[in-house]
């Protein structure tokens, strides 16, 4: 029951971190003008990951794409791509952690694979959360950069009476929204590990049986049969008899005295 | 037909408070942010207030915690409440509104309505 | 306070003239987010409201002939008549619309020689 709630809850947690990253990258108030110590504006500034925006005072906003592609800085189209390597991780993780919910029953699929894909989206949501956070985090860390850099240089061409006056950006809201959200698909992907264990079989079947040939004492060990879904490598056998079956990791690789009937 | 009308105005004592309305028609009055300006009598234009569609709210630093700008965008008007007047915000007062797509300039501006501060 | 200043106070021109008055910020109306610049024109006429003339430093609105064109960016702009009419005899108002307090310039009046 708990590894059922544990794995429902971490698909939940890193669904709305998912949803979250999406809106993040799609959001255009990654920096927005910094207003503090600038004279009141009639008109705001603020900048996606693909287009820039106006908004007026007069409540009209304008927004205009980046239409060129090398044109752009390789610190922006690096954190492009880390935040489309975290959506389609944690799309893919989505996929597959429907799949290993303990509550979906799809046809005879056994625990120990239902294990696997769950350890699996675990980690592409791990993965998917740490791609938003350092994207958000490499936006910022350029942001803080060009914030001092432009303070420094804050009026320029102070011919006479004339200031030009340098617009600066802070963090906006879409930087938030992508912390946040990265860091909940990591949680999820976290309490979809931890379920993983809960939902993979302590016990399997034995890895070395001894038959007792009449009138001969040999040892008759087949390879070990391993449920294998592609999911994975660490797989745990399927569990076909209860009685004083042992686990890979108890198997003795001598002869011992469990071996002989 | 776009039509800002003022009204409200009058000769009024230092101190004294006057209430200055704006009634626009012909146009979606909700969907506009709106100013008013006053012309002094050397014929000066100075901007006194904005309200924005969003309620976002600007004066001029004059008139700060003196006048008041509102809307009522269910009766189409803009407001500007004006207490403790002095002798130097006696003008010319226009209603006026933001185009669009005017880059934030003044598209539409009423007949205007006169404000007299004198003992 | 962004400071608006327009020269000449006042022009006197025969019908048929080419005008020109130019009006300077004391701080820089191109937004650098759009590249556009914050800058309009008014004509007042006696006994009448002002009426916006440019918007955005260049465009001219709606109805407005085509002999009134605005000019320049950042700190300088100017306002051009190309062949001055008798009914546009008026005052001339700039006005920073980047900045509040939305300033307007002390204006130019264009008088008849």
């Known amino acids: 029951m708990a590894v059922t709630a544990c794995q429902g809850l971490g698909f939940v947690v890193s669904l709305i971190g998912i949803a979250g990253i999406i809106a993040a990258t799609c959001m255009d108030q990654w920096s927005t003008q910094d207003l503090y110590n600038n004279p009141v504006t009639a008109v705001f500034n603020y900048q996606g990951l693909w287009r820039s925006c106006v908004r007026e005072s007069s409540g009209f906003t304008e927004c205009r794409g980046y239409f060129t592609l090398l044109g752009l800085p390789a610190m922006l189209q690096a954190v492009r791509a880390l935040m489309i390597v975290g959506i389609v991780l944690g799309a893919i993780g989505l996929l597959v952690s429907i799949f290993a919910l303990k509550c979906i029953r799809i046809g005879s699929m056994e625990d120990s694979a239902k294990a696997n894909m769950t350890l699996t989206s675990g980690i592409m949501f791990i993965v998917s959360g740490l791609c938003a956070i350092a994207g958000v985090s490499v936006f910022a860390n350029m942001l803080v950069t060009n914030f001092w850099m432009s303070t420094a240089n804050m009026y320029t061409g102070m011919g006479g009476m004339v200031q030009t006056v340098q617009t600066r950006y802070t963090f906006g809201a879409a930087l938030f929204v992508g912390w946040v959200a990265g860091g909940l698909t990591l949680i999820g992907g976290v309490m979809m590990c931890i379920a993983c264990r809960g939902l993979a079989p302590e016990e399997t079947n034995y890895k070395a049986v001894s038959y007792h040939a009449s009138g001969h004492s040999v040892a008759y060990k087949p390879g070990g049969f391993k449920a294998s879904t592609g999911f994975g490598s660490n797989t745990k056998n399927k569990k076909i008899y209860d009685g004083g079956a042992r686990t890979e990791d108890e198997v003795q690789s001598y002869p011992s005295k469990h071996d002989y009937v | 037909e776009v039509r800002l009308v003022e009204s409200g105005g009058g000769l009024v004592k230092p101190g004294g408070s006057l209430k200055l309305s704006c009634a626009g028609s012909?146009?979606?009055?909700?969907?506009?942010?709106m100013s008013w300006v006053r012309q002094t009598p050397e014929k000066r234009l100075e901007w006194v207030a904005t309200i924005t569609i969003g309620v976002n709210i600007y004066y001029l630093d004059s008139v700060k915690g003196r006048f008041t700008i509102s809307r009522d965008n269910a009766k189409n008007t803009l407001y500007l409440q004006m207490n403790s007047l002095r002798s130097e915000d006696t003008a010319l007062y226009y209603c006026?509104?933001?185009?669009?797509?005017?880059?934030?300039?003044?598209?539409?501006w009423g007949q205007g309505t006169s404000v007299t501060v004198s003992s | 306070d962004i400071v608006m200043t327009q020269s000449p106070t006042s022009l006197s021109v025969s019908a048929g003239e080419k005008v020109t008055m130019t009006c300077k910020s004391s701080q820089s109306l191109l937004n650098s987010g759009n590249q556009k610049n914050y800058l309009a024109w008014y004509q007042e006429k006696p006994g009448q409201p002002p009426k916006l003339l440019i918007y955005?430093?260049?465009t001219r609105e709606s109805g407005v002939p085509d002999r009134f064109t605005g000019s320049g960016s950042g700190t300088d702009f100017t306002l051009t008549i190309s062949s001055v009419q008798a009914e546009d005899l008026a005052v001339y108002y700039c006005q920073n619309n980047h900045f509040y307090p939305l300033t307007f310039g002390a204006g130019t009046k264009l008088e008849l020689k």
């Open positions: 955005g430093a260049s």
């Open positions: 012909g146009f979606t009055f909700s969907s506009y942010t």
């Open positions: 006026t509104r933001l185009g669009q797509t005017q880059r934030n300039a003044m598209d539409y």
